[in-house]
Amino acid sequence: ITQQDLAPQQRAAPQQKRSSPSEGLCPPGHHISEDGRDCISCKYGQDYSTHWNDLLFCLRCTRCDSGEVELSPCTTTRNTVCQCEEGTFREEDSPEMCRKCRTGCPRGMVKVGDCTPWSDIECVHKESGTKHSGEAPAVEETVTSSPGTPAS
């Protein structure tokens, strides 16, 4: 996901809806005007706000990177939802890019979890059942299994 900057809102164009802040805040899908007296709507597909706020600008919509699919578009109240393409995943500790899932488990291990957009395949030791974590093994160590193969 490309981390977009926050979009400074220019003076409201005539088509932008205005309303008054309530308790100093503007509703989701709006931001507060520079004089604090009006709520100005975000621009659909360009920027958004998710909560009641007194931000002077709406947040710029995320654009999905290549290697990602768009699950849902950006609206004035919700950011774009992007997901890694099939066969790739995004880890919590490296959210900036989708990584290729491993094709199989190291020798002596069995696959107990499939590749998902948010996790690599999961491997456990045949005997102990303990999880294997770390880099993908060298190809000659790899025992491949088709996605439909049940864990033994």
């Epitope: 900057d5 926050l6 979009a7 400074p8 802040p21 308790e23 100093g24 805040l25 507060i32 005007s33 520079e34 004089d35 604090g36 007296r37 909560h51 706020n53 007194d54 931000l55 002077l56 600008f57």
Partner: antibody, heavy 117, light 110 residues
Framework: QVQLVESGGGLVQPGGSLRLSCSAS????????MIWVRQAPGKGLEYVGF???????YYASWAKGRFTISRDNSKNTLYLQMNSLRAEDTAVYYC???????????WGQGTLVTVSS | DIQMTQSPSTLSASVGDRVTITCRAS??????LSWYQQKPGKAPKRLIY???SLASGVPSRFSGSGSGTEFTLTISSLQPDDAATYYC????????????FGGGTKVEIK
């Protein structure tokens, strides 16, 4: 002359209460958001909270529950009610006029609050 | 809450020097940032608003720049009267995020 003048500071015992006032002249506070900022001796500026033109108050997380900001537009005066005071609340307290896009454009001279037994 | 990180915390420079102070926001605030000058025993004074707009009555040797998360205050030719502490403050989302000031930069004259 456009100015803000704080009053009500002084020495108070731990656990005690104090109400600070901020009197505005030369402009109507009813048209502005107003902010309270404090500065402990030898330290930096610390945001306390602010009140919108429609009298909705918002606070720094540490001030919630103990401090209350209010205003009396007829007296053109802003208030800061401080309860359950602690030694670490010792500071100069400033009131200021807050304009959304342009920042805090007008400051009072500050009033010193000392919390000590 | 938005955190503001200012650097350096202190600096010493000679009269006539060009001085730059940096302020970093923990999330983007567009150009909605103000700079303040405070002298000992005095209230702060606004110097710059909207990142680069000079407040009324402020000498033109002061300038501000930046947007997003990185901002700078520059004094083009340091004067004895500029010895003070300088603070940055975000101006967008004060109710939403609070209005934490930067930690301050003390400018001393060599």
């Amino acid at each position: 002359q456009v100015q803000l003048v704080e009053s009500g500071g002084g020495l108070v015992q731990p656990g005690g209460s104090l109400r600070l006032s901020c009197s505005a002249s030369g402009f109507s506070i009813s048209r502005y958001a107003m902010i309270w900022v404090r500065q402990a001796p030898g330290k930096g500026l610390e945001y306390v909270g602010f009140i919108t033109s429609d009298s909705s108050a918002y606070y720094a997380s540490w001030a919630k529950g103990r401090f209350t900001i209010s205003r009396d537009n007829s007296k053109n005066t802003l208030y800061l009610q401080m309860n359950s005071l602690r030694a670490e609340d010792t500071a100069v307290y400033y009131c200021a006029r807050y304009t959304y896009s342009d920042g805090t454009d007008l400051w009072g001279q500050g009033t010193l609050v000392t919390v000590s037994s | 809450d938005i955190q503001m990180t200012q650097s350096p915390s202190t600096l010493s420079a000679s009269v006539g020097d060009r001085v730059t102070i940096t302020c970093r926001a923990s999330q983007s605030i567009s150009t909605y940032l103000s700079w303040y000058q405070q002298k000992p025993g005095k209230a702060p004074k606004r110097l710059i608003y909207k990142a680069s707009s000079l407040a009324s009555g402020v000498p033109s040797r002061f300038s501000g720049s930046g947007s997003g998360t990185e901002f700078t205050l520059t004094i083009s030719s340091l004067q004895p009267d500029d010895a003070a502490t300088y603070y940055c403050q975000p101006n967008s989302g004060i109710a939403t995020y609070g209005a934490a000031f930067g930690g301050g930069t003390k400018v001393e004259i060599k």
